[in-house]
Structure formats: C-alpha cells, structure tokens
C-alpha cells in the first residue's frame, strides 16, 4: 500500500448476462491499469420488490467516486440500479446501501451466485 | 508513450474478405481488453467487436456477428480483426482503440485508423 | 441494445462561452457513460470516463455529470481548439453503443 492506501490487484467478478456476452458467470477478475492510475472494484445490483439481483461485479478503472473507500456502499436514494466502488481486494465481496437522505437499515449482500 | 497502428485496409469487392491487425506498443499489451470501432464516411462511431486482455471473451455487433472475427497475439502485441464476406455497408475506417476492465470500457488510446472499401 | 440519444446534433458558440451537451439512455446505465472529441480526419478521443472522471491531459474546463439515465457534458469556457464533434458511449452493456454526436461550431 502507498501512504496507507489499500491497493486493489483482484475484485469479484459477476455477470449476469454472462450467456449473451459469453464469459463466465463468477470468478476473480485481475485488475490492470496504468501505473499512474488508481483501481478500484465496484458492484451493481437491483433490488426487486426486496430482491437483490447482482447485474455486474468486477474492476473498476481510477474514479475519484471511489477513492480511500474500503467498503462498497450505495448513497443514492432509491436508484433504477445500484453501483457502489471501493478499494482493496475483493472489497466487492460485499455491498450496501446507505442513503444519505433517510436513515434506513442497510440492505446486504445476501446473494451467493449461483452456477449455472 | 502509447501507439497503436492499423494495416490492412484497403479496396475489396462485396463477398471479399480482409484481415486487418492492429500493432501496439507503450503499454503492457497483454494486461488490457481490445475493441475494433467503424466510422462510416461522414457517419458516427460504430463499436464493431471488443477482447478481454486473455482472449477469454469476445464481444460482436449484430452487424458483423458471424463474418468478423477478433483475436489477439499478446506474444507480438498484435490486435487482429478477420473481416469475411464483406458488404458495402462495411465501408469505413477502422480504428482500433484500447479498453480498460472489461466491465469498463472505456477506449482510452486509439489507432490513426484504416480505410476499408467494399466496393464492385 | 441500449440506444444513446444525444442533442442538440449540432450548435454554434462562441469562445469563451459556456456549452451543455445531453445525452439520453434508453434504460438506466448506472455511470458507465464516456464522453469523446473528435476532429475531422482524426481519431477520437477520450474526454470522460465513468461519466464524471476527467481523462488524463484534458483541461479542467471539461465536466461530466449525471448517472442513470440523463448525462450532461460541459465545457465551462469554449476555447479555439474545442470545437469539434463530440459523442457519447455506454459500457454498461455489450453491444457497446455511441450517440449519434454533437458537432460545435464557431458561431
């Protein structure tokens, strides 16, 4: 880590449409980038009448949005589709939602991919 | 400093096939995801086919799904894109552009581009 | 396919002044939106990424917002070299698609 700031080499992998786009569905994914660029990992999920539906997790390329965030948290009230970011390995493991304008309980990963 | 060259193009009549390639350099080829993206004359961009940085996964436009085929060679550091059964809609330069993850792609280098015209 | 509809196609302005483009997904994109410049005969190239991040060596007088659905690209100060055909991209989903592009004119 530089200055104390966890350096992300590996995030989560998930893609829902992973038959369309012909990838694997889960996995670990490396993440590469420039070396004067910051990587980040990043999740988005829907939550459908209180079902959570992971769309994508994976690597996410040096978005200040994410900076010196070690846990991956959605602040946007009520979104069409939830996108949180973080720093550190497999920071994506796990994701929230925290509303900055409400104070409501978090809504959790529950979710284990299932194979196909 | 990182470059990207297209060749290959050139004039082909409808039903021909081209192969163009795409030479990197600058930048660990082999650690990046790779798109081929059109532009008709005086028309907008057209994002034909992408490759994760393994070769693992390929993506394709409807347009050209079952005629173009992307591959890469990351021990030359060539990105190729094999162009079958041609149509006079494929007329367009052909840039080749560097992705970053592939859930995030964003083409943040791109190739001078090559013409390619299908034409009798 | 996610459609991507940008407007206006094409604006005059004067140096100096302040330019708005829009750019509209047919369903949410979270914020996986790019924007790109291009001039005549030459490649495009990258001016936003993840619809707020600036790409590197681009003037600061660049700015993206917006998330979802409704994405807007600013140039605060219109200088001599902006003008120039300007699109938007998606990368939520493969196929990746493009606006049909804004050109910027000298008035």
């Known amino acids: 880590a530089i200055l104390g700031r966890s350096e992300t080499q590996e995030c989560l992998f998930f893609n829902a449409n992973w038959e369309r786009d012909r990838t694997n569905q889960t996995g670990v994914e490396p993440c590469y980038g420039d070396k004067d660029k910051r990587r980040h990992c990043f999740a988005t999920w829907k939550n459908i009448s209180g079902s959570i539906e992971i769309v994508k997790q994976g690597c996410w390329l040096d978005d200040i949005n994410c900076y010196d965030r070690t846990d991956c948290i959605e602040k946007k009230d009520s979104p069409e589709v939830y996108f949180c970011c973080c720093e550190g390995n497999m920071c994506n493991e796990k994701f929230s939602y925290f509303p900055e304008m409400e104070v409501t309980q978090p809504t959790s990963n529950p979710v284990t991919p299932k194979p196909p | 400093e990182v470059q990207l060259l297209e060749s290959g193009g050139g004039l082909v009549q409808p039903g021909g096939s081209l192969r163009l390639s795409c030479a990197a350099s600058g930048f660990t080829f082999s650690s990046y995801s790779m798109n081929w993206v059109r532009q008709a004359p005086g028309k907008g961009l057209e994002w034909v086919a992408g490759i994760n940085y393994n070769g693992g996964y390929k993506g394709y436009a409807d347009s050209v799904k079952g005629r173009f085929t992307i591959s890469r060679d990351n021990s030359k550091n060539t990105l190729y894109l094999q162009m079958n059964s041609l149509r006079a809609e494929d007329t367009a330069v052909y840039y080749c552009?560097?992705?970053?993850?592939?859930?995030?792609?964003?083409?943040?280098?791109w190739g001078q581009g090559t013409l390619v015209t299908v034409s009798s | 396919d996610i459609q991507m509809t940008q407007s206006p196609s094409s604006l005059s302005a004067s140096v100096g002044d302040r330019v708005t483009i829009t750019c509209r997904a047919s369903?949410?994109?979270?914020?996986?939106l790019n924007w790109y410049q291009q001039k005549p005969g030459k490649a495009p190239k990258l001016v936003i990424y993840a619809a707020t991040s600036l790409a590197s060596g681009v003037p600061s007088r660049f700015s993206g917002s917006g998330s979802g659905t409704d994405f807007t690209l600013t140039i605060s100060s219109l200088q001599p070299e902006d003008f120039a055909t300007y699109y938007c991209?998606?990368?939520?989903?493969?196929?990746?698609?493009f606006g049909g592009g804004t050109k910027v004119e000298i008035k």
């Open positions: 991209q998606q990368s939520y989903e493969l196929p990746l698609t």
């Open positions: 552009a560097r992705g970053a993850n592939w859930h995030d792609t964003h083409l943040d280098y």
């Open positions: 369903q949410s994109i979270v914020r996986y």
